[in-house]
């Protein structure tokens, strides 16, 4: 969930050095605060569509609204894998795609969105109320997951509006890198604000909104912001409230919600481990574990249509030295 600050409208102060300085010290913190609360958190959207031609055929589309590079996308159904869900497809920007039945065709649509077509026959075919989840592992944000399903009354051929991200998991990796800089910025901002309290404020024209801590409001991506991100199908229905962790009632709703706390702590040796280890410079990490891919230049990159490659969180590992111990 992203939040944005409503910045109070400031009238220009009276001319003069003190006025100019006061203007600068007031505007800078508010700009910083706006950046602080809007730039930090990515979103995931999910769209589920039942095909009109084949009643038990589904198309799932997922996208990531974030600035980081995507390392992996996992699509599951029946909830997140590890919390009662079953993996349907895993997509890696360089290494390719792995699918499980009844997945028929998974592919990259853009660098930040994927689609998956599900076969609709046999015991493993999906039903109309199935929950589909997409998890994006991204650097530096960490892992972000959202789920969606067809509304009970859906007509074939109609799609459920993409759901704004119920963010089920944000690894500690999100605190690193850019987020770390933001955190520092926010601390610095608070310091500025505290200092500003003890200074005579410049005279302002009366305003309805007093320059106190701004109210934050829930943010759903606007059409304009999505267009800027070039993410297709991301027409967010802002009328629907994003599901959050407070929907995790043990006795109500889909059964997998009750397992969310377990799922949130599901990968203890994942990015959280970075917090206690030195973080190498981006692209400098070389592991000799993947001895299989030692012959440089032999491994063709797996790319989807129009997909350009972007770096893995831990640097280039596709072609490395002979097998050895890290």
């Amino acid at each position: 969930m992203r939040t944005e600050a409503q910045v109070p409208a400031l009238q220009p102060p009276e001319p003069g050095l003190e006025g100019a300085m006061g203007h600068r010290t007031l505007v800078l913190p508010w700009v910083l605060l706006t950046l602080c609360v809007t730039a930090g958190t990515p979103e995931v959207w999910v769209q589920v569509r039942m095909e009109a031609t084949e009643l038990s055929s589904f198309t799932i589309r997922c996208g990531f609204l974030g600035s980081g590079s995507i390392s992996l996308v996992t699509v599951s159904w029946g909830g997140p894998n590890g919390a009662g869900g079953t993996t349907l497809a895993v997509l890696h920007p360089e290494r390719g795609i792995r699918q499980w039945a009844p997945a028929r065709q998974a592919r990259w649509e853009t660098q930040s969105s994927i689609s998956l077509i599900l076969e609709g026959s046999g015991a493993s075919s999906p039903c109309a109320n199935t929950t589909f989840c997409c998890k994006f592992a991204s650097f530096p944000e960490g892992s972000w997951e959202a789920c969606g399903s067809l509304p009970p009354s859906s007509d074939p051929g109609l799609s459920a509006p993409p759901t704004p991200a119920p963010i089920l998991r944000a690894d500690l990796a999100g605190i690193l890198g850019v987020s770390g800089v933001l955190l520092f910025g926010c601390v610095y901002l608070l310091h500025l604000l505290r200092r500003h309290k003890h200074r005579p404020a410049p005279r302002l024209q009366p305003s309805r909104t007093s320059p106190q801590a701004p109210r934050a409001r829930a943010w759903a991506p606007s059409q304009a912001s999505q267009a800027a991100l070039h993410v297709p199908y991301a027409t967010i229905n802002t009328s629907c409230r994003p599901a959050t962790l407070d929907t995790a009632h043990p006795h109500g709703g889909p059964s997998w919600w009750a397992s969310l706390p377990t799922h949130a702590a599901h990968r203890p040796q994942g990015p959280a481990a970075w917090a206690s280890t030195p973080i190498p410079a981006r692209g400098s990490f070389v592991s000799v574990e993947n001895g299989l891919y030692a012959q440089a230049g032999e491994r063709p990159p797996h790319t989807g249509p129009g997909l350009t490659l972007f770096p893995d969180p831990r640097g280039p590992r596709a072609m490395e030295g002979p097998l050895g111990v890290r």
Epitope: V90, N290, L323
Partner: antibody, heavy 126, light 107 residues
Framework: EVQLLESGGGLVQPGGSLRLSCAAS????????MSWVRQAPGKGLEWVSA????????YYADSVKGRFTISRDNSKNTLYLQMNSLRAEDTAVYYC???????????????????WGRGTLVTVSS | EIVLTQSPATLSLSPGERATLSCRAS??????LAWYQQKPGQAPRLLIY???NRATGIPARFSGSGSGTDFTLTISSLEPEDFAVYYC?????????FGGGTKVEIK
Amino acid sequence: EVQLLESGGGLVQPGGSLRLSCAASGFTFSGHLMSWVRQAPGKGLEWVSAISGSAGETYYADSVKGRFTISRDNSKNTLYLQMNSLRAEDTAVYYCARDAYYDDWSGWADWYFDLWGRGTLVTVSS
Amino acid sequence: EIVLTQSPATLSLSPGERATLSCRASQSVSRYLAWYQQKPGQAPRLLIYDASNRATGIPARFSGSGSGTDFTLTISSLEPEDFAVYYCQQVSLLPPTFGGGTKVEIK
């Protein structure tokens, strides 16, 4: 030395249970998906089960689902396969195999197997 | 589940000859196919991954080709140690499945 060593095989009656172990050494065990692959006498290879690196997500072949349980102990660098309700058709050499791709974060696995143990024979017979 | 059919079941050749092994998938597996070599009493050994890429330490005489449903493993000039059983494996649609194997024997 990079290696996998299976143990725990033997003769068991139909309906019985057996627990196989696979000790890994010489590599970062927690960063690899690990699988069990079996081979019936004189037959081809059949993938049985897999478990992801640190997340512990599990996968099973339909033929063993509900009867076999895969697990791992990353602190001991050991992979396990608990086999219950054994049938004659489960008779095979069971190999422990390492996924070719090392990934301790995102969870990707290639599902190609670049390191295999020597295998342990499981015989189900009355 | 994707079925892999290997042919021929047995290939009788002499050292120095060229061996061509085939693997056909029941549906497209893109290029997500591997080849393994297995000698009697030993575990399988990964030779080729992603249809055409040699694994570490595999001699250049081994090469793989193909995509979609038809794949070929070629051994350009057979060495005495190459006589073994060869399996193909697909990983496009999981669970991974193996072909029935091709035995390359000395003529």
